[in-house]
């Protein structure tokens, strides 16, 4: 008496489900359900998602489409792919910027902001890994520069300059007194 039995939809093709009073074919991706079918194994009335909305999958129950996300300009995000009826906007970072996740367990749907990539050249270092999903990985100092503290220092241009041991090894100079 509970009404827990859910009769199987015995229709040709497998994309049928009881909607309203009958088993109906669902709506394709990019369409929402306007009205259920009015005959067994019939077609539901489906309408295309309006502009700036989408539905990514075939569906039986969505009577409205999801609003497309807007990329967060405050977080320096840009649209890598515009929203369509079947797919949400894909937000990312413009060239020269990388994704910095705002949560520790980062997944594709996690909130993020865009950070400018390190310019290894400006730091007088080799670029070991180009910036894309994470920041640029800079390597050793460029020719004509040597490690000093956290940075790269230019080799002295004359014998008058001081050239510590690391400098001498890289620059080929001996300390002159």
């Amino acid at each position: 008496q509970g009404g827990t039995r859910s009769p199987r939809c015995d229709c040709a093709g497998d994309f049928h489900k009881k909607i309203g009073l009958f088993c109906c074919r669902g709506c394709p991706a990019g369409h929402y359900l306007k009205a259920p079918c009015t005959e067994p194994c019939g077609n539901s009335t489906c309408l295309v998602c309006p502009q700036d909305t989408f539905l990514a999958w075939e569906n039986h129950h969505n009577s409205e489409c999801a609003r497309c996300q807007a990329c967060d300009e405050q977080a320096s995000q840009v649209a890598l792919e515009n929203c369509s009826a079947v797919a949400d906007t894909r937000c990312g970072c413009k060239p020269g910027w990388f994704v910095e996740c705002q949560v520790s367990q980062c997944v594709s749907s996690s909130p993020f902001y865009c950070q400018p990539c390190l310019d290894c050249g400006a730091l007088h270092r080799h670029t070991r890994l180009l910036c894309s999903r994470r920041d640029t990985d800079c390597g050793t100092c460029l020719p004509g520069f040597y490690e000093h503290g956290d940075g790269c220092v230019s080799c002295p241009t004359s014998t008058l300059g001081s050239c510590p041991e690391r400098c001498a090894a890289v620059c080929g100079w001996r300390q002159m007194f």
Epitope: G3, R5, L21
Partner: antibody, heavy 120, light 111 residues
Framework: EVQLVESGGGLVQPGGSLRLSCAAS????????MSWVRQATGKGLEWVAA???????FYPGSVKGRFTISRENAKNSLYLQMNSLRAGDTAVYYC??????????????WGQGTLVTVSS | DIQMTQSPSSLSASVGDRVTITCRAS??????????MHWYQQKPGKAPKLLIY???NLESGVPSRFSGSGSGTDFTLTISSLQPEDFATYYC?????????FGGGTKVEIK
């Protein structure tokens, strides 16, 4: 035991309104599609409206725009709001439950009916 | 809308008789391997009672002397041996599409 009890019938003037109620018990009301069916004296049965368990409503052309079916699952109740009533709407109105084994409308339990008379 | 025509509109029969009622739809009510035709019994002053669904399936609790057959547009309800409690009016109903419609009824009276 499944029970459907209609109420709200009576005498109403042409152009008037009436709201019928159906109190359901003995089953999980929210899981079932429900219908209203009417029968004029000495005549056959006529389907008037249906409300599916997932929230959709259906009407024949003869009452569309004049009648509104609704349900309140928390109260195990089905309603029929009838506006712009005509003499031709005079009938006994039955509340009926659709069978849960069916993915098509067939009615396995009926109430005893409530009489609606439209007359001046 | 699908029109449902029942015949005869009334009949007189005796206890023990075999009774056949027919229902003709204005278009086929069969699709996807099923015939969406159902039969109800109604006694005076009472609510209808479901007897047969999908043309030939006996509703739970209904005596086996009731049977249904047919497909497409022509359907039959048969009572193999009429009992005193079977004197009533019988209606067919389709659910092939909306709106749902019923036949005009067949009244089975005592001869």
């Amino acid at each position: 035991e499944v029970q459907l009890v209609e109420s709200g019938g009576g005498l109403v003037q042409p152009g008037g309104s009436l709201r019928l109620s159906c109190a359901a018990s003995g089953f999980t009301f929210s899981n079932y599609d429900m219908s209203w069916v009417r029968q004029a004296t000495g005549k056959g049965l006529e389907w008037v409206a249906a409300f599916s368990s997932d929230g959709y409503t259906f009407y024949p052309g003869s009452v569309k725009g004049r009648f509104t079916i609704s349900r309140e699952n928390a109260k195990n109740s089905l309603y029929l709001q009838m506006n712009s009533l005509r003499a031709g709407d005079t009938a006994v109105y039955y509340c009926a439950r659709h069978a849960d084994y069916a993915n098509y409308p067939v009615m396995d339990y009926w109430g005893q009916g409530t009489l609606v008379t439209v007359s001046s | 809308d699908i029109q449902m025509t029942q015949s005869p509109s009334s009949l007189s029969a005796s206890v023990g008789d075999r009774v056949t009622i027919t229902c003709r739809a204005s278009k086929s009510v069969s699709t996807s391997g099923y015939s969406y035709m159902h039969w109800y019994q109604q006694k005076p002053g009472k609510a209808p009672k479901l007897l047969i669904y999908l043309a030939s399936n006996l509703e739970s609790g209904v005596p086996s002397r009731f049977s249904g057959s047919g497909s497409g547009t022509d359907f039959t309800l048969t009572i193999s041996s009429l009992q005193p409690e079977d004197f009533a009016t019988y209606y067919c109903q389709h659910s092939r599409e909306l709106p749902l419609t019923f036949g005009g009824g067949t009244k089975v009276e005592i001869k």
